[in-house]
Amino acid sequence: LCQGSNYSTCASCPSCPDRWMKYGNHCYYFSVEEKDWNSSLEFCLARDSHLLVITDNQEMSLLQVFLSEAFCWIGLRNNSGWRWEDGSPLNFSRISSNSFVQTCGAINKNGLQASSCEVPLHWVCKKCPFADQALF
């Protein structure tokens, strides 16, 4: 069911890889180390996943339970407006953004925050489990 689109929702999610957490119909990876935004994206892509794209407030609230004050990179960037890596606009939540040079999105337990993209942060990857092929 996940085949055919890079950004579909997993329907059946039997299992996640080691060190990935199964939540709902997806697998999530919370990094221990820190990287800049681009390196975090590359890490996720190399593991058939993507930097976290949050689909709605419910998913965001659930994920924030696992987060601390420390920020984690997610698949959100400001290219003439805040957009997720799947191309969809950020429309269900506010991002705290202060400066023109802060064009990458991060999340912690308190919400979304813009940051300069080269800041080393933890990151979150998201993917469908083994039985499915899509990234989301």
Partner: antibody
Framework: QVTLKESGPGILQPSQTLSLTCSVS??????????VGWIRQPSGKGLEWLAH???????WYELALKSRLTISKDSSKNQVFLKIANVDTADTATYFC?????????????????WGPGTSVTVSS | DVLMTQTPLSLPVSLGAQASISCKSS???????????LEWYLQKPGQSPKILIY???NRFSGVPDRFSGSGSGTDFTLKISRVEAEDLGVYYC?????????FGAGTKLELK
């Protein structure tokens, strides 16, 4: 809209301590990635970086002046403070505060995207 | 400390003409993370500096496209394609790649 405004004593005597305040609005001093730095400019001369303080209270100083400088902040009042001990006439300058944006290093690489208008300080006996 | 040398110190220009300011660093200011933290600021008479360019060539928000930054390693240039009266003032380059961060001595852009 982001604004910064410096205030100081205007004139003070050699060996006294200079106390400067930077009052900010339009952003929070405790927001991740935000900092405030102090820069000075003697009349008709260039710019000299002095110190900066980050959102989490991490502080950095110009090495040559470090023993005389103290930077601090009160996030609840949106103010950043700089003290310069034992001033002399060489400290006569316009003092600017500027917002600095974090790029991943505490000590260096940042952008100063908003500046205050500056406050003039004269050290004279 | 990284010495930032700006040339010329004074640049007389005619309105509508192109202006070019050079900034050379005493050592490479390419950071170990691959980025080059070279910025340009303009200080108009009686005002505080304003950021124009960050990371060598990125124009800051609201900066007109007649301003462009270029360069790499130790050699950097700010170009103004068609000088307007509001562009007059002192231009400073700034490196943030190495501690302590340092400014150039400034280039005064004035009318010929």
């Amino acid at each position: 809209q982001v604004t910064l405004k410096e205030s100081g004593p205007g004139i003070l005597q050699p060996s006294q301590t200079l106390s400067l305040t930077c009052s900010v609005s339009g952003f929070s001093l405790s927001t991740f990635g935000m900092g405030v730095g102090w820069i000075r400019q003697p009349s008709g001369k260039g710019l000299e970086w002095l110190a900066h303080i980050w959102w989490d209270d991490d502080k950095w100083y110009e090495l040559a002046l470090k023993s005389r400088l103290t930077i601090s902040k009160d996030s609840s009042k949106n103010q950043v403070f700089l003290k310069i001990a034992n001033v002399d006439t060489a400290d006569t300058a316009t003092y600017f505060c500027a917002r600095v944006i974090y790029y991943g290093s505490r000590s260096a690489y940042y952008s100063m995207d908003y500046w205050g208008p500056g406050t003039s300080v004269t050290v004279s006996s | 400390d990284v010495l930032m040398t700006q040339t010329p110190l004074s640049l007389p220009v005619s309105l509508g003409a192109q202006a070019s300011i050079s900034c050379k660093s005493s050592q490479s200011i390419v950071h170990s993370n691959g980025h080059t933290y070279l910025e340009w600021y303009l200080q108009k008479p009686g005002q505080s500096p304003k950021i124009l360019i960050y990371k060598v060539s990125n124009r800051f928000s609201g900066v007109p496209d007649r301003f462009s930054g270029s360069g790499s390693g130790t050699d950097f240039t700010l170009k103004i394609s068609r000088v307007e009266a509001e562009d007059l003032g002192v231009y400073y380059c700034f490196q943030g790649s190495h501690v302590p961060v340092t400014f150039g001595a400034g280039t005064k852009l004035e009318l010929k």
